[in-house]
């Protein structure tokens, strides 16, 4: 026994053009609610067929009134989970129908009016006790996002909720041949012996000595496939008692069953008996395995050898995603240091280093001054991947080999004359100017347009500046 749980995340317009009109209006406010119907196995039954695994109805959502002219947003949802209890084993594969209903809250006579907004259906494989599975389904222009899981109710455990757990009789360990009941480690797996010969694939038991059959199987040991045809002859005369088909073209003509399935007629239609690994109304569905080549870009597919087991893709370097379909942009991590240029070559990363740097990631700063000398007493300065010489007074050029003419740049302003000197240069200023570069005019009244004097100096004292 256990519970199937459904969490609706959003219901609103799907992507793409043709957004649906809001289901509610200012004149007719409304609210949503959801119905879920579960059926065991992967049979593609009509929506009206019974929900053999169970059904549930959600609470009503908050009242919603459309804003005039606004596109339909995601609509307000009811709180809480939809829970469908199941009494027997969880079948592992199941079909679901989720319906979105609108309850109009206008002033209808006889209470609110209900109308079906959208219906989605699907078939899934799901082990009880696993994590939430996320899903997106579209119905017309609407999109429904939801998650679901199946969980066992104690004392049941396992992927089908068929193993039972009982409290330990002794505090330290379980009895002989019995295992601790993960995840309830303080409990022990109950000894559960089904009827001798009960099919391990198609039968199970909840009480010792019984043999209960999964859907599609019958007989005392669940070894006989269920046959839905009640006719002795496939073209027998129509009869109210047998429910047999009337003569005429048979539904199996032309064999509608794909993938080697064999067709048998039923009172209403036909039924396909599918080969191992295939299912669906026409055997057109099969599990995705490694034979499908689901791993891309050289990804290694592991598991999934038989139709009932999942596959996992192990991706090569540079690729990610459940199917290795996404290329990792390894350069986005900026692996190249010191301004190096990153190149993703697919099989490897390369860094193209700026001058003065080296290494796989440009991490080594080369000694720019190694083996380089600056002449005439200049000193070498490293920087930015190139060496530079700081030259002694009177010398210049890349390596300080050129004798500098300090007067070449005409440093003396206002017509001052420049003289090269062992300590640099000296400016002889023209009348009316003063300063190291003749930059300050001397005013006729004896004051000069000097900058504010440093502490201890009086403005207008030209001798101090000479």
């Amino acid at each position: 026994a256990g519970v199937f749980e459904l969490q609706i995340h959003s219901f609103g317009p799907g992507p793409g053009p043709g957004a649906p009109r809001s289901p509610c209006s200012a004149r007719l406010p409304c609210r949503l609610f959801f119905r879920v119907c579960l059926k065991p196995g992967l049979s593609e039954e009509a929506a009206e067929s019974p929900c053999a695994l169970g059904a549930a109805l959600s609470a009503r959502g908050p009242v919603y009134t459309e804003q005039p002219g606004a596109p339909a947003p995601d609509l307000p949802l009811p709180d809480g989970l939809l829970q469908v209890p199941f009494r027997d084993a969880w079948p592992g594969t199941f079909s679901f129908i989720i319906e979105t209903w609108r309850e109009e809250l206008g002033d209808q006579i006889g209470g609110p009016a209900w109308s079906l907004l959208a219906r989605v259906a699907g078939r899934r494989r799901l082990a009880a006790g696993g994590p939430w599975a996320r899903d997106i389904q579209r119905a017309g222009a609407w999109e429904l996002r939801f998650s679901y899981r199946a969980r066992c109710e104690p004392p049941a455990v396992g992927t089908a909720c068929t193993r039972l757990c009982r409290p330990r009789s002794a505090p330290s360990r379980c009895g002989p041949g019995l295992r601790p009941c993960a995840p309830l480690e303080d409990e022990c797996e109950a000894p559960l012996v089904c009827r001798a010969g009960c099919s391990p694939e198609h039968g199970f038991c909840e009480q010792p000595g019984e043999c209960r059959c999964l859907e599609g199987w019958t007989g005392p040991l669940c070894t006989v496939p269920v046959s839905t045809s009640s006719c002795l002859s496939p073209r027998g005369p129509s009869s109210a008692t047998t429910g047999c088909l009337v003569p005429g073209p048979g539904p199996c003509d032309g064999n509608p069953c794909a993938n080697g399935g064999s067709c048998s007629e039923t009172p209403r239609s036909f039924e396909c008996t599918c080969p191992r690994g295939f299912y669906g109304l026409r055997c057109e569905v099969s599990g995705v395995t490694c034979a499908d080549g689901p791993c891309f870009n050289g990804g290694l597919c592991v598991g999934g050898a038989d139709p009932d087991s999942a596959y996992i893709c192990h991706c090569p370097p540079g690729f990610q995603g459940s199917n290795c379909e996404k290329r990792v942009d390894r350069c986005s991590l900026q692996p190249c240091r010191n301004g190096g240029l990153c190149l993703d070559l697919g099989h490897a990363l390369r860094c193209r280093c700026r001058a003065g740097f080296a290494g796989p990631r440009c991490e080594h700063d080369l000694d720019d001054c190694a083996g380089r000398a600056c002449a005439n007493g200049g000193t070498c300065v490293e920087g930015g991947g190139a060496h530079r010489c700081s030259c002694a007074l009177g010398f210049g050029g890349r390596d300080c080999r050129e004798r500098a003419d300090p007067c070449a740049a005409r440093p003396c302003a206002h017509g001052g004359r420049c003289y090269a000197h062992f300590s640099g240069l000296v400016c002889a200023c023209a009348p009316g100017y003063m300063g190291a570069r003749c930059e300050f005019p001397v005013h006729p009244d004896g004051a000069s347009a000097l900058p504010a004097a440093p502490p201890g100096l009086r403005p207008g004292d030209p001798q101090r500046y000479l």
Partner: nanobody, 117 residues
Framework: QVQLQESGGGLVQAGGSLRLSCAAS????????MGWHRQAPGKQRELVAN???????NYADSVKGRFTISRDNAKNIVYLQMNNLKIEDTAVYYC???????????WGQGTQVTVSS
């Protein structure tokens, strides 16, 4: 529920070309794989080529360089361009669709490709 409709099979001489198409309809989700498998008489069904909706592809070694898979995501159609066909390419070609992170996938009814000498 997904329905797959194949077309483009037929009889062709060795060295010739054919183009198969497969259109998917129904609940075709954004992230999926569409592709082609084939089954020759008395042999196992094998993957020929497939393509993720994101653009990644896989090819069987025996068809690399001769067959090209492509798809139109907007229309949910996958194509298989088969050039330089060989006798051993004779088989029933099945379209295959499956959604990412889904337990199951769907098959088309198959289209016969016969390569004669």
């Amino acid at each position: 529920q997904v329905q797959l409709q194949e077309s483009g099979g037929g009889l062709v001489q060795a060295g010739g070309s054919l183009r198969l198409s497969c259109a998917a309809s129904g609940s075709t989700f954004t992230s999926n794989v569409m592709g082609w498998h084939r089954q020759a008489p008395g042999k196992q069904r094998e993957l020929v080529a497939n393509m993720h909706s994101g653009g990644s592809t896989n090819y069987a070694d025996s068809v690399k360089g001769r067959f090209t898979i492509s798809r139109d995501n907007a229309k949910n159609i996958v194509y298989l361009q088969m050039n330089n066909l060989k006798i051993e390419d004779t088989a029933v070609y099945y379209c295959r669709w499956y959604g990412i992170q889904r337990a199951e996938g769907y098959w088309g009814q198959g289209t016969q490709v016969t390569v004669s000498s």
